[in-house]
């Protein structure tokens, strides 16, 4: 794959992943739950990072933000922070990578500068993807832990007799946002890796212009006037490197045959 294609594909994959991270962060369906059920109506609950919604089988839906709520899990704040950091790094990564794209010419920016910017954006995308994956995984773990804990302490106080509180065991599932977040984080990470790989191809390799090494297959090497290389061994496979005007091109793996200059 060409450097431009690798860089471009990495950018597109990261962009899709980044959009997914934003979508996941904004989505309300991080977890879903049955809150209430009877033969007539059912109340479903879906919760996001910012608000919780109830939807009834009758069609009634109501969402409420967490602003005034005390006692939210501390891990929720950590997940929010991780997702926001992921988005911020993604934004910076996109801005940097736009200028780094080989197919876009900006002023007199040379390949060395573009390579550095490509590497920078790649690293930013990798960290952004990791933040999203960790954030979503922490939330999933928090969900499982909290539900296990509250189920273990299901009855507190006389099994729910008068004046007491009883924890209700309900079915819960991971919401769509978790899967969106995992996939998006993975795509951003992959895109970032591709950008880093593309950076290696963008780095100008000056070694081709500085020196060309000569190798002979035999031990005794003699040079005759005229610049020909002589070696021992008839019909042995020597690696002749002939320098052309281009300076950077070499010709490898040619079969050498005995000539009048070879020693026998």
């Amino acid at each position: 794959m060409s450097v431009t294609a690798c860089q471009g594909l990495g950018f597109v994959v990261s962009l899709i992943g980044f959009a997914g991270i934003i979508a996941a962060t904004c989505m309300d369906q991080w977890s879903t739950q049955d809150l209430y059920n009877n033969p007539v109506t059912a109340v479903f609950n879906y919760q996001g990072l910012w608000r919780s919604c109830v939807r009834e089988s009758s069609g009634f839906t109501e969402c409420r933000g967490y602003f005034t709520l005390l006692g939210l899990p501390a891990m929720l704040q950590a997940v929010r922070a991780l997702m926001i950091v992921g988005i911020v790094l993604g934004v910076i990564g996109i801005l940097v990578s736009i200028f780094a794209l080989k197919c876009i010419r900006i002023g007199s920016m040379d390949d060395s500068a573009k390579a550095k910017m490509t590497l920078t954006s790649g690293i930013l995308f990798i960290i952004s993807g990791i933040c999203a994956i960790i954030g979503v995984s922490v939330f999933a773990n928090m969900l499982v832990t909290n539900f296990w804990m509250s189920t273990a302490n299901m009855y507190s106080g006389m099994g729910g007799m008068g004046g007491m509180v009883q924890t209700v065991q309900t079915r819960y599932t991971f919401g769509a946002a978790l899967f969106v977040g995992w996939v998006a984080g993975g795509l951003t990470l992959i895109g970032g890796v591709m950008m880093c790989i593309a950076c290696r191809g963008l780095t100008p390799d000056d070694s081709n212009f500085k020196a060309v090494s000569y190798h002979a297959s035999g031990q005794n090497v003699a040079y005759r006037p005229g610049g020909f290389k002589a070696s021992t061994g008839f019909g042995s496979n020597t690696r002749n490197k002939k320098i052309y005007d281009g300076g950077a091109r070499t010709e490898d793996d040619e079969q050498s045959h005995p000539t009048k200059y070879d020693y026998v």
């Epitope: 109830v54 009834e56 928090m142």
Partner: nanobody, 120 residues
């Protein structure tokens, strides 16, 4: 913590009417549903009627057509209007409040109960 307080119980003659009230107070995220249960001496607690936040109602067969449940979301209060009362309706009536707890299982809060006696 959520406090649940019932009121409106008392002695009523057969065929009479009674209106029970239940108010929830305290700090909580959101009430999902409120309802009334009753427990007669020597028997298990049974559902009378429930109402969800959206206003969907459910009545036990024993009270269908004879009772109406309503609620005031702003006041976190639920009402049970019972008509054509029979002696078998005699029981302690408990108010139930189901509260949503974000990222946890929901909690059911119960009142201490109000006595309803149907007797001539």
């Amino acid at each position: 913590e959520v406090q649940v307080q019932e009121s409106g119980g008392g002695l009523v003659q057969p065929g009479g009417s009674l209106r029970l009230s239940c108010a929830a107070s305290g700090s909580f995220f959101r009430i999902v549903a409120m309802g009334w249960y009753r427990q007669a001496p020597g028997s298990q607690r049974e559902l009378v009627a429930t109402i969800t936040r959206g206003g969907s109602t459910y009545y036990a067969d024993s009270m269908k057509g004879r009772s109406t449940i309503s609620r005031d979301n702003a006041k976190n209060t639920v009402y049970l209007q019972m008509n054509s009362l029979k002696p078998e309706d005699t029981a302690v009536y408990y108010c139930n409040v189901r509260v949503e707890v974000p990222f946890m299982q929901p909690n059911d809060y119960w009142g201490h109960g109000t006595q309803v006696t149907v007797s001539s």
